[in-house]
């Protein structure tokens, strides 16, 4: 992503930052945006990062909330930066294999599962 | 999901069909399937599942390994059904707020995040 | 009011340089990024980066990555477009603009400076 | 890159007529579409942003929508002002991008 801050410290940043403006940010008490209704978060960055681009609309301009949106703009950029990496190398089977062994080891250990 | 069978158990028999099947799923050696290069795999979710159809198209069919793609078909639905419930329910800011906060929380204790 | 004013343009020579400016005042720099685009002689419009002179974070369309180098000073309220190896192809005006930081809409716009390689 | 291509790239009309431009995507741009006008030898103007939003001061003649990939602009009872060079923009995906732009001439 186009900045030297480390994406980690950028995040840790930006939750402070999120409950710093908290109160300014919920001023608006018409506004409706759609929030998902699971905790699997990665499945959700689209709606995530559009529901940030509606917030960001309502909200008065300037000041230090600024720097939160600007930190939320990075974030995105990181998620989409991985994104892009999920189809850029093509390997042999065995190691499309251990990737989906991964993938449905972490879904049977941490995801929430509904019955 | 359209079966009988809960999702957590579906992701367990499906684990261990991969590990019963591997000789099977390998013996074509000149296949490449994309595979993402980082483990936040819930980002990866579509790549993984072309993956999947492009394997099972180069693999021999019948036998029990044909339930082996079943029930990833099974699994694939309960993901698009998830992600359908990503941006369902229309809330106050205050709610999506929150579910801001524990999005970047997580990103923040269990994401492997590249400097 | 927000005022975005654009320097620097004129007539360059084809392999020469020239650093454009932007003077912003109005509102506190610091706050917001702020957006290059070209728009070369009946044409449309192009985006070349933006630079957020808080951070110092700089963010370029591929296209003009070996063209153009954005910077900020802030204390005097300004932005830069620095390109160097002038093309014909790189007569156009260029307008400096503010946007808001996450959605990306340009909602404050300058005046424009024109840059003609000849 | 996201490629935006408007149609039509020019078209005619008169005053109280009322016009349609659109914008169609390469690839999904969410809502993250927005729409400018310019008129010669001025800086453009935002008119409508994240699709439908109308920018302070627009009158309310502009209207948007779409998401996705297909989006378009309204502007009902045509004034005497509104012909000028209509631009759509992405800013969801890298690079930003904008369309080609649609020319509204007088009829």
């Known amino acids: 992503i186009p900045t030297e801050i480390p994406t980690s410290a950028l995040v840790k940043e930006t939750l402070a930052l999120l409950s710093t403006h908290r109160t300014l940010l919920i001023a608006n008490e018409t506004l409706r945006i759609p929030v998902p209704v699971h905790k699997n978060h990665q499945l959700c960055t689209e709606e995530i990062f559009q529901g940030i681009g509606t917030l960001e609309s309502q909200t008065v301009q300037g000041g230090t909330v600024e720097r939160l949106f600007k930190n939320l703009s990075l974030i995105k950029k990181y998620i989409d930066g991985q994104k892009k990496k999920c189809g850029e190398e093509r390997r042999r089977v065995n190691q499309f294999l251990d990737y989906l062994q991964e993938f449905l080891g972490v879904m049977n250990t941490e995801w929430i599962i509904e019955s | 999901i359209p079966t009988e069978i809960p999702t957590s158990a579906l992701v367990k028999e499906t684990l261990a069909l991969l590990s019963t099947h591997r000789t099977l799923l390998i013996a074509n050696e000149t296949l490449r399937i994309p595979v993402p290069v980082h483990k936040n795999h819930q980002l990866c979710t579509e790549e993984i599942f072309q993956g999947i159809g492009t394997l099972e198209s180069q693999t021999v069919q019948g036998g029990t390994v044909e339930r082996l793609f079943k029930n990833l078909s099974l699994i694939k639905k309960y993901i698009d059904g998830q992600k359908k419930k990503c941006g369902e329910e229309r809330r106050r800011v205050n709610q999506f707020l929150d579910y801001l906060q524990e999005f970047l929380g997580v990103m923040n204790t269990e994401w492997i995040i590249e400097s | 009011e927000v005022q975005l004013v654009e320097s620097g343009g004129g007539v360059v020579q084809p392999g020469g340089s020239l650093r454009l400016s932007c003077a912003a005042s109005?509102?506190?720099?610091?706050?917001?990024?702020l957006n290059w685009v070209k728009q070369a002689p009946g044409k449309g419009l192009e985006w070349i980066g933006w630079?957020?002179?808080?951070?110092?974070?700089?963010d370029y369309a591929e296209k003009f990555k070996k063209k153009a180098t954005l910077s900020a000073d802030t204390s005097r309220n300004s932005a830069y477009l620095q390109m160097n190896d002038l093309r014909p192809e790189d007569t156009a005006i260029y307008f400096c603009?503010?946007?808001?930081?996450?959605?990306?809409?340009?909602?404050?716009w300058g005046q424009g400076t024109l840059v003609t390689v000849s | 890159d996201t490629v935006l291509t408007q149609s039509p790239s020019s078209l005619s009309a008169s005053v109280g007529d009322s016009v349609t431009i659109t914008c169609r995507a390469s690839?999904?741009?969410?809502?993250?579409l927005h729409w400018y006008q310019q008129k010669p030898g001025k800086a453009p103007k935002l008119l409508i942003y994240?699709?439908?939003k109308l920018e302070s001061g627009v009158p309310a003649r502009f209207s948007g929508s779409g998401s996705g990939t297909d989006f378009s602009l309204t502007i009902r009872s045509l004034q005497p002002e509104d012909f000028a060079t209509y631009y759509c923009?992405?800013?969801?995906?890298?690079?930003?991008?904008f369309g080609q732009g649609t020319k509204l001439e007088i009829k």
């Open positions: 994240l699709a439908s």
């Open positions: 603009a503010r946007s808001r930081n996450y959605g990306g809409y340009i909602n404050y």
């Open positions: 630079i957020d002179p808080d951070y110092g974070t700089t």
């Open positions: 923009q992405q800013t969801w995906n890298d690079p930003r991008t």
């Open positions: 109005g509102y506190t720099f610091t706050d917001y990024v």
């Open positions: 690839e999904s741009v969410s809502t993250f």
